[in-house]
């Protein structure tokens, strides 16, 4: 997250970290069910671990943390590497979470976002770009949803209805390492960090997010079929 600020503790209990061994964070994710996460399809790895209820980036033990294995990862069948359409994936955890003030699911919004909606994006991704500098704790950033026209103008022939753009002033954006993390609007999960320009936070080059309102049926049916 570029030019965000430290999230208040306990305010993002649905935020998950996907880790490669030994403790290398490579993507964010979102708890949407007691045993299921959503993340970006481009975050798929065969071997990874899931950390929930953790505030700092470092692997130091925190009393609220819960660790999991992913037993099943189900990318949306319409995703096409290295493209960006349908960039979402469900991950089934090896057990249900223990609900606490630090670990709690969030509902996926069934309403599509309208331009001007205020949202919050969070993650442990780099705080500088093109340099790489990772934060000590989870970062939060207020962003506004842009109109689909402004989104298409920013990225001609690259935007479809499975994506939406959001941003703020130049210099504020999600970035590498935030992928798969949540965009929360009006208390519901509206999007996942998907892609954007490089370097991040360039003027008139907003962040692009998976438009989850288009996928509520697929999410529900996939969870039911695999529970």
């Amino acid at each position: 997250i570029i030019n965000g600020s430290d999230c208040d503790m306990h305010t993002q209990p649905w935020q998950a970290a996907l880790l490669l061994r030994p403790n290398q964070l490579y993507c964010g994710a979102v708890l949407v069910h007691p045993q299921w996460l959503l993340t970006a399809a481009h975050c798929r790895k065969k071997v990874f671990r899931v950390r929930l209820g953790h505030y700092s980036l470092s692997p130091v033990y925190e009393s609220g943390q819960q660790m999991f294995q992913g037993v099943k990862s189900i990318p949306h069948p319409g995703y096409s590497h290295p493209g960006h359409s349908n960039d979402l994936m469900l991950i089934k955890l090896n057990r249900r979470i223990r609900p606490t003030k630090d670990v709690r699911p969030i509902n996926v919004s069934s309403h599509c976002p309208s331009a001007g909606t205020k949202c919050l994006v969070s993650g442990w991704g780099t705080t500088k770009s093109p340099q790489v500098h990772f934060p000590k704790v989870l970062q939060c950033l207020n962003i506004s949803v842009l109109s689909q026209k402004r989104c298409e103008d920013a990225y001609p022939r690259q935007i479809d209805d499975t994506m939406f753009c959001a941003g703020d002033k130049a210099g504020r954006d999600s970035c590498q390492g935030d992928s798969g993390g949540p965009v929360v609007c009006n208390g519901s999960l509206q999007g996942l960090v998907s892609w954007g320009d490089y370097p991040c936070a360039r003027p008139n080059r907003p962040g692009v997010y998976t438009n989850l309102c288009k996928f509520t049926k697929w999410i529900q049916e996939t969870i039911q079929a695999n529970s």
């Epitope: 071997v47 069948p77 995703y79 290295p82």
Partner: antibody, heavy 117, light 110 residues
Framework: EVQLQESGPGLVKPSGTLSLTCAVS????????MSWVRQPPGKGLEWIGD???????DYASWAKGRVTISQDSSKNQVSLKLSSVTAADTAVYYC???????????WGQGTLVTVSS | AYDMTQSPSSLSASVGDRVTITCQAS??????LAWYQQKPGKAPKLLIY???TLASGVPSRFSGSGSGTDFTLTISSLQPEDFATYYC????????????FGGGTKVEIK
């Protein structure tokens, strides 16, 4: 050097159990999923199953109930057991490492197991 | 089931030819497809993963494309060392799968 080496009896009697081990060197099992694949003489590749560092195991549908895959991280080895074998299980058996992007990037040299009385 | 069908099962070609092998999945596997090359008496070798990403050390004459159900392996200019059997493998799911591999395509000298 990253290396995989399968070993086990080359001959197994019908209705017996085929047991193979895959010795892993040059990388820790804790970081990778491992696969077993077989190839009957003159035929194509057949996936048997995968084992993850967390000991989660996925088997081919034909192998469920007959195959057991396990690992010993302290010895850095993976094992395959196939019970109630018949002549149709005669094949070269390979272990392989997944590159974490769903491609098998390191393979053992394979070991031929013949099922015959 | 996610069945993988390769075609052709064999083909004859000359050095320098452009060769195309196809792999079709019975359901969408998104981009989780790998290609392997196998020579007689040897273990398979990974060529391409994620449908189009070239594995380390693989010559650039090999390329992969496709997504969903239809995939292609192309050898832009066939070399003598490329005569072998090629297999595709899906990595989209391991659940209730008979075989993740396609049946293979043997590339022979014309």
């Amino acid at each position: 050097e990253v290396q995989l080496q399968e070993s086990g009896p080359g001959l197994v009697k019908p209705s017996g159990t085929l047991s193979l081990t895959c010795a892993v060197s040059g990388f820790p099992l804790s970081n990778y999923a491992m696969s077993w694949v077989r190839q009957p003489p003159g035929k194509g590749l057949e996936w048997i199953g995968d084992i993850y560092p967390s000991d989660i195991i996925d088997y081919a549908s034909w192998a469920k109930g007959r195959v057991t895959i396990s690992q010993d991280s302290s010895k850095n080895q993976v094992s395959l057991k196939l019970s109630s074998v018949t002549a149709a299980d005669t094949a070269v058996y390979y272990c392989a490492r997944d590159n974490n992007d769903y491609g098998l990037d390191i393979w053992g040299q394979g070991t031929l197991v013949t099922v015959s009385s | 089931a996610y069945d993988m069908t390769q075609s052709p099962s064999s083909l004859s070609a000359s050095v320098g030819d452009r060769v195309t092998i196809t792999c079709q999945a019975s359901q969408s596997i998104s981009s989780w497809l790998a290609w392997y090359q196998q020579k007689p008496g040897k273990a398979p070798k990974l060529l391409i993963y994620l449908a189009s990403t070239l594995a380390s050390g693989v010559p650039s004459r090999f390329s992969g494309s496709g997504s969903g159900t239809d995939f292609t392996l192309t050898i832009s200019s066939l070399q003598p060392e490329d005569f072998a059997t090629y297999y595709c493998q899906q990595g989209y799911t391991d659940s209730n799968i008979i075989n993740t591999f396609g049946g293979g395509t043997k590339v022979e000298i014309k």
